[in-house]
Amino acid sequence: LKGQEFAPSHQQVYAPLRADGDKPRAHLTVVRQTPTQHLKNQFPALHWEHELGLAFTKNRMNYTNKFLLIPESGDYFVYSQVTFRGMTSECSEIRQAGRPNKPDSITVVITKVTDSYPEPTQLLMGTKSVCEVGSNWFQPIYLGAMFSLQEGDKLMVNVSDISLVDYTKEDKTFFGAFLL
Amino acid sequence: LKGQEFAPSHQQVYAPLRADGDKPRAHLTVVRQTPTQHLKNQFPALHWEHELGLAFTKNRMNYTNKFLLIPESGDYFVYSQVTFRGMTSECSEIRQAGRPNKPDSITVVITKVTDSYPEPTQLLMGTKSVCEVGSNWFQPIYLGAMFSLQEGDKLMVNVSDISLVDYTKEDKTFFGAFLL
Amino acid sequence: LKGQEFAPSHQQVYAPLRADGDKPRAHLTVVRQTPTQHLKNQFPALHWEHELGLAFTKNRMNYTNKFLLIPESGDYFVYSQVTFRGMTSECSEIRQAGRPNKPDSITVVITKVTDSYPEPTQLLMGTKSVCEVGSNWFQPIYLGAMFSLQEGDKLMVNVSDISLVDYTKEDKTFFGAFLL
């Protein structure tokens, strides 16, 4: 719809209008992750709960095999939060010895796979250095934005280290999208 | 609306359509918090400005007594940011003495209260360890996601420590929701 | 539309309805920033990519000279993420010498400029202290909320230090808005 122009908003528009409740929507929530193979040089993808608790998919938006499947072309708002937690990061120990170092980091990427491009497209990235001294640490990374997606596109959430993801509560780590 | 299926999107849909401007919406902004009693083991709820400055409620979305009241069932996007600020956290002093410790933390929870359900439901949580050494610190936690809400549901924002909330500016700490 | 009341949602509404694809929308992505003069006591504004890669503007939402131009009045969801990166912050060195100090900080502000109003309005602010010891650091600040905007309003993103903005990837630093 990128360049599409409709009648000015003060005019009457009769068709083809949408009932808002008919729009594809999904909110997925975290589950315990099972270790899986992932491609070299590609962060592992999270899998999700899609029907229990707060999670749902509706109006032809389906979840399968770590992917949200986009059922119709349009502009979608896509969001995710991943809460990470870990022990003291390695860099802080090196740091204490007085040697500056590239810090450990945590990263979340919302990725689109499309039939017309041989590589995944990174839609959103949140990346943060972690240099904590002498303690357990935890923190969320939140992402959200609007994208023009095509029918058949697939969305997934990749993380730098699946073992650091807090999977204990559905409100801490989640992933969603809805057609605008 | 979870399992509801409408006519395919290529068909004409005539009713019952909504004028978008008719949808319940609210954006609330921070005010200075008055100390109040809160239940043990439950984070205190923030109260909010609902009509001055950037704040507004419209189309039957009302704010009362720390709660946003959901006037009709549907899928809502709900969001909040809370900016925290404080002095050096306790854990950092312990840490300096060489004793690792569970760090201080800051937490925001967006909570749903349903009359027909005894326990509040935590919709969204942002929680972060805070281990700052020798300085004042400040940082925001942002949350946002889509939820299926019912008419009569109430939403509130709870925080781990109300005294750490930055109430100085309406753009730093806020809470909102809108029907999709 | 603030106080406007429509027919209850269970009634049929025939006009003036909108085709959703007709609504003003934009997603802008980061580009390398050219140093520019900015007013003293005012954070510099970022400029943006508006048509290449993931970036787009549509339905009369235009981007010009660091501003998103609002083409019609209504409620908009406005969002931005800025990823910052830098070397060890100054405060940490002072800190190591045992002198507590107001830490370095990073700040993002989404600002509204209205021709009829002399002062820009800060819609959203994300501000964070940065006190890293002995390392490079990087981290995002995300903001998003709903605002009632008027035709002709202009939106921009201001940052505390343009030299710390990570402009390397379109998924790390972005700015968008869409009419609800």
Epitope: T64, Y117, P118, K154 | - | -
Partner: antibody, heavy 116, light 106 residues
């Protein structure tokens, strides 16, 4: 090892239905998209359609849409092509192609002749 | 349909020569793909997204262009480059290929 292998009858009678199967190995089909492309003798390449195996979404070349069907069986790691009401003009090498999220890969092709 | 017009339809060049093939789309596309097909073999992806070299493809191959006009270049033709080269757009439905350029050695 990643492989795409087309299989099916090499000869189909006019007005009958051409059926081909692509069996994949070495990758998860659900992570990708599977296409069918054909090349008629001495001619260029023609895209026929694709399926998104995880959800089953299909797209077809409008010039073939009334005759072509692409399906998948993820349990067998197979994608199938059916082309109905064939004529001699459908004689071609038919390729199964993987795209999306992973490097493009083509099968070696299957020659199908339409003749009575 | 978006029509892809490829030129020339064939060319003959010497080993070491720079070879250029152009592809024009009937309407603007974001991405262009270039394939190499040797006789009796399946096509092989060389360039995606107009200018990205596919994995394992020699650096003498390159692509450029945007909108409607795209160019594919072999900087120094080698004997093993004898093949037919196709451009393809993946945006409109249907996805369409150019008619091909046959490259031969003089």
């Amino acid at each position: 090892q990643v492989q795409l292998q087309e299989s099916g009858p090499g000869l189909v009678r006019p007005s009958q239905t051409l059926s081909l199967t692509c069996t994949v190995s070495g990758f998860d089909m659900a992570d990708t998209y599977m296409h069918w492309v054909r090349q008629r003798p001495g001619r260029g390449l023609e895209w026929m359609g694709r399926i998104e195996p995880a959800g089953g979404h299909t797209k077809y070349n409008p010039s073939l849409k009334s005759r072509v069907t692409i399906t998948r069986d993820t349990s067998k790691n197979q994608v199938s092509l059916r082309l109905s009401s064939v004529t001699a003009a459908d004689t071609a090498v038919y390729y199964c192609v993987r795209s999306g999220g992973l490097p493009d890969m083509w099968g070696q092709g299957s020659l199908v002749t339409v003749s009575s | 349909d978006i029509q892809m017009t490829q030129s020339p339809s064939s060319l003959s060049a010497s080993v070491g020569d720079r070879v250029t093939i152009t592809c024009r789309a009937s309407s603007s596309v974001s991405y262009m793909y270039w394939y190499q097909q040797k006789p009796g073999k399946a096509p092989k992806l060389l360039i995606y997204g107009a200018s990205n070299l596919a994995s394992g493809v020699p650096s003498r191959f390159s692509g450029s262009g945007s909108g409607t006009d795209f160019t594919f270049t072999i900087s120094s033709l080698q004997p093993e480059d004898i093949a037919t080269y196709y451009c393809q757009q993946w945006e409109g439905n249907p996805r369409t290929f150019g008619q091909g350029t046959k490259v031969e050695i003089k």
